[in-house]
Interface confidence: medium
């Protein structure tokens, strides 16, 4: 019925706001942040991959998340050029059809994937923390794997919209070819359910995990240190806590109360110029800090590992892995020297550390 | 679901005019614009006018100074008043609701009319 060909699009006029969020520090200071992103977080997650394939045998659960959590950020850190072309470009797309699905669909996989990654390593370490007898046949290395498969699947679920809705098209009143969504009449509400699915799927319930599984570990570690009354309380365990869910809360904060304001914006809710210019300006920049810190994950993740911190630093001085063959029977424990759950009495040792990868 | 009803199309002498109108009806869930596009025996169906939700206008090259866009809020209708008309002007009219800012969609109604005669 419309021709949408991506030679010529289709001819269009925008909404009300077609200056909303059009800044030129805006051109400006977006690619530059894309492009520190880009460079530290493709130095960052190719050492991690490195690190935990080469140097420690991809050998716990823990580091089988680690791995595909830098590998997801990888998927995408490939595509930030695009957009920091675009940007650059004054939200001109030059890339053609193809690439538009490409990009925008990566973007929507590092989201769901790099999320559901932590939410799975977050019960991860409260199984094998709280209950690490009991969990010992369930964290296997193959559940680990068979786990990451799920949740590639499932990204890639949350992407097709991307793939099937993302077109470049030509905006009349504007004269600039765009990549956006673009939905048929009988599809006007989906934008509405990927920015609550966004917020809910993607954000809410994964965040409850993480900090339900967190407070569990608290919980349980704070039993053990009352029981050794006489051993030093270690500090440093809840301080890893706090930091682990405060960074993932206020990474991803920003980009959710913004997506949630574009759906009430997108809703008819929501008229105000001022305030579609103030969320239009606001989402790329919440996008830098959602993603940088994304990109980052595995890196802090992995320095609360003392093995993975020396292989690490042992990689920049170039210090070739030593020769060793891939275990993948091994499901070797990956946290704590003394355990909750364990016989006190028997454990001189004090609670650290509850982080290791390996 | 929405539904646009056009109407006001018909025949009509080289140089005359005529109003289109078209009126939106349902539950739209956007901010939306409206606007016109035209669809003659053998072509592509190409834009002709558009008026956004706080009447910001737009039109085609080629119907500049003889078109007029306008709206009323207050009843979701849209109207077009074509003057001057030629016969190059004869095609289907078709009534569109669109809207988004990062996100787009396009309603289409089912098309009026519109002939213009040497």
């Known amino acids: 019925i419309l021709n949408s060909s991506t030679e010529d699009g289709i001819k269009r006029i925008q909404d009300d706001c077609p200056k909303a969020g059009r800044h030129n520090y805006i051109f400006v200071m977006i690619p530059t942040l894309y492009s520190i992103i880009f460079v530290v977080g493709i130095f960052g997650n190719s050492l991690v991959v490195i690190v935990i394939y080469f140097y420690m045998k991809l050998k716990t659960v823990a580091s089988v998340f680690l791995l595909n959590l830098a590998l997801a950020d990888l998927c995408f850190l490939l595509t930030l050029p695009l957009w920091a072309v675009y940007t650059a470009m004054e939200y001109r797309w030059p890339f053609g059809n193809y690439l538009c699905k490409i990009a925008s669909a990566s973007v929507s996989f590092n989201l769901y994937a790099s999320v559901f990654l932590l939410t799975c390593l977050s019960i991860d370490r409260y199984l094998a923390i709280v209950h690490p007898m009991k969990s010992r046949l369930r964290r296997t290395m193959l559940v680990a794997k068979v786990t990451c498969i799920i949740i590639w699947l499932l990204a890639g679920l949350a992407s097709l919209p991307a793939i099937i809705h993302r077109n470049v098209f030509f905006i009349e009143n504007t004269n600039i070819t765009v990549c956006a969504f673009h939905y048929e009449s009988q599809n006007s509400t989906l934008p509405i359910g990927l920015g609550l699915t966004k917020n809910i799927l993607g954000f809410l319930f994964p965040f409850l995990i993480i900090l339900t599984s967190y407070t569990l570990i608290w919980k349980a570690l704070k039993k053990a240190y009352e029981i050794q009354k006489n051993k030093p309380r270690n500090d440093d365990i809840f301080k890893i806590i706090m930091a682990i869910v405060l960074f993932f809360f206020f990474s991803w904060i920003p980009h959710q109360i913004f997506t949630f304001l574009d759906v009430l914006i997108q809703l008819g809710i929501i008229r105000d110029c001022r305030i579609a210019d103030i969320v239009d300006t606001a989402m790329p920049i919440t996008i830098c800090i959602a993603y940088f810190n994304n990109c980052l994950n595995p890196l802090f993740y992995g320095f609360l590992g003392k093995k993975f911190k020396r292989y690490f630093l042992q990689l920049l001085k170039y210090i070739p892995p030593k020769a060793k063959s891939h275990s993948n029977l091994s499901t070797k424990m990956s946290t704590l020297s003394y355990r909750p759950s364990d016989n006190v009495s028997s454990s001189t040792k004090k609670p650290a550390p509850c982080f290791e990868v390996e | 679901q929405v539904q646009l009803q056009e109407s006001g199309g018909g025949l009509v002498q080289a140089g005359g005019s005529l109003r289109l109108s078209c009126a939106a009806s349902?539950?739209?869930?956007?901010?939306?614009?409206m606007g016109w596009y035209r669809q003659a025996p053998g072509k592509e169906r190409e834009f002709v006018a558009g008026?956004?939700?706080?009447?910001?206008?737009n039109y085609a090259d080629s119907v500049k100074g003889r078109f007029t866009i306008s709206r009323d809020n207050a009843k979701n209708t849209v109207y077009l008043q074509m003057n001057s008309l030629k016969p190059e002007d004869t095609a289907v009219y078709y009534c569109?609701?669109?809207?988004?800012?990062?996100?787009?969609?396009?309603?289409w109604g089912q098309g009026t009319q519109v002939t213009v005669s040497s």
């Open positions: 569109a609701a669109w809207g988004g800012r990062t996100d787009y969609f396009v309603y």
């Open positions: 349902g539950y739209i869930f956007y901010r939306y614009s």
């Open positions: 008026i956004s939700y706080g009447a910001t206008t």
